[in-house]
């Protein structure tokens, strides 16, 4: 007996071939011997089976001795043994119909769990193997669970259902609602304008919700809310903003914030949260601001950075076109009685310059 696997809602062709390539009498029945379809003259006739309105056959192939039955909009309960009677012989085809669906909405927040449930005919014992867009393999039986969705789980999941050495493939589109980056750091010289961008890792037709940016300045004892905003159909409107700093926010996506000036008292880290309508939980993105200041006071040339820096970052003071350099893995470096000329303050990570500020030292007579 031939086994054919089908997908719920899909269309399947059950083949039945006669030895002679000519038009001949045939009919298809189910396991209860109820006629589904057959031939009468050149006409396709339908029987009393509940399948009849979804069953068809291709007349153009009858001349080739092919008397297939096509079943549209498959249901789990269509799983059965079908019998094709042609040329005084019977061909049996066992059809097994499976369905694979996500238990919840397929738009899930990062960190939430995904459960895929397999619908299968009674008596079947299928196995399921799913592959995420990032190449992660998960196996299961009637259910497959992914406990904590990650950003890279967004996309098409390919699930293979196996039964009796046959396979059928399902594709399920999962959208993980998250920001493109978990964290980002902006490096600025004191006084420069600061741009914070929070691009989303997904697109939705309608995007509605509300958000807030909480900021923990390095110099402050507690965090404070810098801005709150609403999002309606991808349009951004500010609800409340602090007086200091006076942030500005773009009206369109991606979420975009502008801090007019980078000042040492603003250096620190923030957490932007976005709550989407009809979704439990929030999207998060951490953002850090590092501010550099180079100053000369009397005989002392100083370079300082404020904000969250890693201990492996190097701060250097260097005289342009000269070898004179002072470097430290610290947040401040200084030179006493600096030579006249253009000095560079550099914040670097393994040789890569993240931030630089120039200061001119004039000769003292």
């Amino acid at each position: 007996k031939k086994v054919v696997l089908g997908k719920k809602g899909d269309t399947v062709e059950l083949t039945c071939n006669a030895s002679q390539k000519k038009n001949t009498q045939f009919h298809w029945k189910n396991s209860n011997q109820i006629k589904i379809l057959g031939i009468q003259g050149l006409f396709l006739t339908k029987g009393p089976s509940k399948l009849s309105d979804r069953a068809d056959s291709r007349k153009s192939l009858w001349d080739q001795g092919c008397f297939s039955m096509i079943i549209k909009n498959l249901k789990i309960e269509d799983s059965d043994t079908y019998i094709c009677e042609v040329e005084n012989k019977k061909e049996e085809v066992e059809l097994l119909v499976f369905g694979l669906t996500a238990n919840s909405d397929t738009h899930l927040l990062e960190g939430q769990s995904l459960t895929l449930t397999l619908e299968s005919p009674p008596g079947s014992s299928p196995s399921v193997k799913c592959r995420s867009p990032g190449g992660k393999n998960i196996q299961g039986g009637r259910t497959i669970s992914v406990p904590q969705l990650e950003r890279q789980d967004s996309g098409t999941w390919t699930c293979t259902v196996s039964q009796d050495q046959k396979t059928v493939e399902f594709k399920i589109d999962i959208v993980v609602l998250a920001f493109q980056k978990a964290s980002s750091t902006v490096y600025k010289k004191e006084g420069e304008q600061v741009e914070f961008s929070f691009p989303l890792a997904f697109t939705l037709e309608k995007l509605t919700g509300s958000g807030e940016l909480w900021w923990q300045a390095e110099r402050a004892s507690s965090s404070k809310s810098w801005i709150t905003f609403d999002l309606k159909n991808k349009e951004v409107s500010v609800k409340r903003v602090t007086q200091d700093p006076k942030l500005q926010m773009g009206k369109k996506l991606p979420l975009h914030l502008t801090l007019p000036q980078a000042l040492p008292q603003y250096a620190g880290s923030g957490n932007l949260t976005l709550a989407l309508e009809a979704k439990t939980g929030k999207l998060h993105q951490e953002v850090n601001l590092v501010v550099m200041r180079a100053t000369q006071f009397q005989e002392n040339l100083t370079c300082e950075v404020w904000g969250p820096t890693s201990p492996k970052l190097t701060l250097s003071l260097k005289l342009e076109n000269k070898g004179a350099t002072v470097s430290k893995q610290a947040k401040a470096v200084w030179v006493l009685n600096p030579e006249a000329g253009m000095w560079q303050c550099l914040l670097s990570d393994s040789g890569q310059v993240l931030l630089e500020s120039n200061i001119k030292v004039v000769p003292t007579w």
Partner: antibody, heavy 115, light 107 residues
């Protein structure tokens, strides 16, 4: 709601190969047959050939020597190649789904063969 | 190969008229026949299949009849949206073939 979207080169020189692809969205790919039909400007419809998801093909004898229809089930797409084109192959080319009847159809692609 | 012949090649009619288009097959095709409507610059649209079955979403003013070699498409009361070209198609055997078309214009 199943939709067929087709694309390919619209301007060819004589003797070149016509190449078109049709993608199937929002519906079953297996179980159906997938056809190409053409319509010269101001004229009637001519069936070119068909393929199913397992790659079984049937072609119009008048074009069989020059036609290849292939399928990519992983992408739910099927393609048409017509070799050695001449001005007589200038037409709007349609893809369509069928069991016995053509429904639905792609939007059509005008292919012009001119030196 | 089965030849399909439509008549008339063109017909002019007014809104509200009853219009009949015929299609003849060169051999018996039982009821393996479909009718399509095509508007300029658009793909054909299935109206009738299996000679007399109305496709889902098609207005009931369209009807099909016939069997064997002679078939008819009838529009009971012509509407402004019905001015188009109509084709018949046989699905009895390869190669599938279409009639040459009937252009239905405004009188």
């Amino acid at each position: 709601q199943v939709q067929l979207q087709q694309w390919g080169a619209g301007l060819l020189k004589p003797s070149e190969t016509l190449s078109l692809t049709c993608a199937v969205y929002g519906g079953s790919f297996s179980g159906y047959y997938w056809s190409w039909i053409r319509q010269p400007p101001g004229k009637g419809l001519e069936w070119i050939g068909e393929i199913n998801h397992s790659g079984s093909t049937n072609y119009n004898p008048s074009l069989k020597s020059r036609v290849t229809i292939s399928v990519d089930t992983s992408e739910n797409q099927f393609s048409l190649k017509l070799n050695s084109v001449t001005a007589a192959d200038t037409a709007v080319y349609y893809c369509a789904r069928l069991v016995n009847w053509f429904d639905p159809w792609g939007q059509g692609t005008l292919v012009t063969v001119s030196s | 190969e089965i030849q399909m012949t439509q008549s008339p090649s063109s017909v002019s009619a007014s809104v509200g008229d009853r219009v009949t288009i015929t299609c003849r097959a060169s051999q018996d095709i039982s009821n393996w026949l479909a009718w399509y409507q095509q508007k300029p610059g658009k793909a054909p649209n299935l109206l009738i299949f299996a000679a007399s079955s109305l496709q889902t979403g098609v207005p009931s003013r369209f009807s099909g009849s016939g069997s064997g070699t002679d078939f008819t498409l009838t529009i009971s009361s012509l509407q402004p949206d019905d001015f188009a070209t109509y084709y018949c198609q046989q699905a009895n055997s390869f190669p599938y073939s279409f009639g040459q078309g009937t252009n239905l214009g405004i009188k």
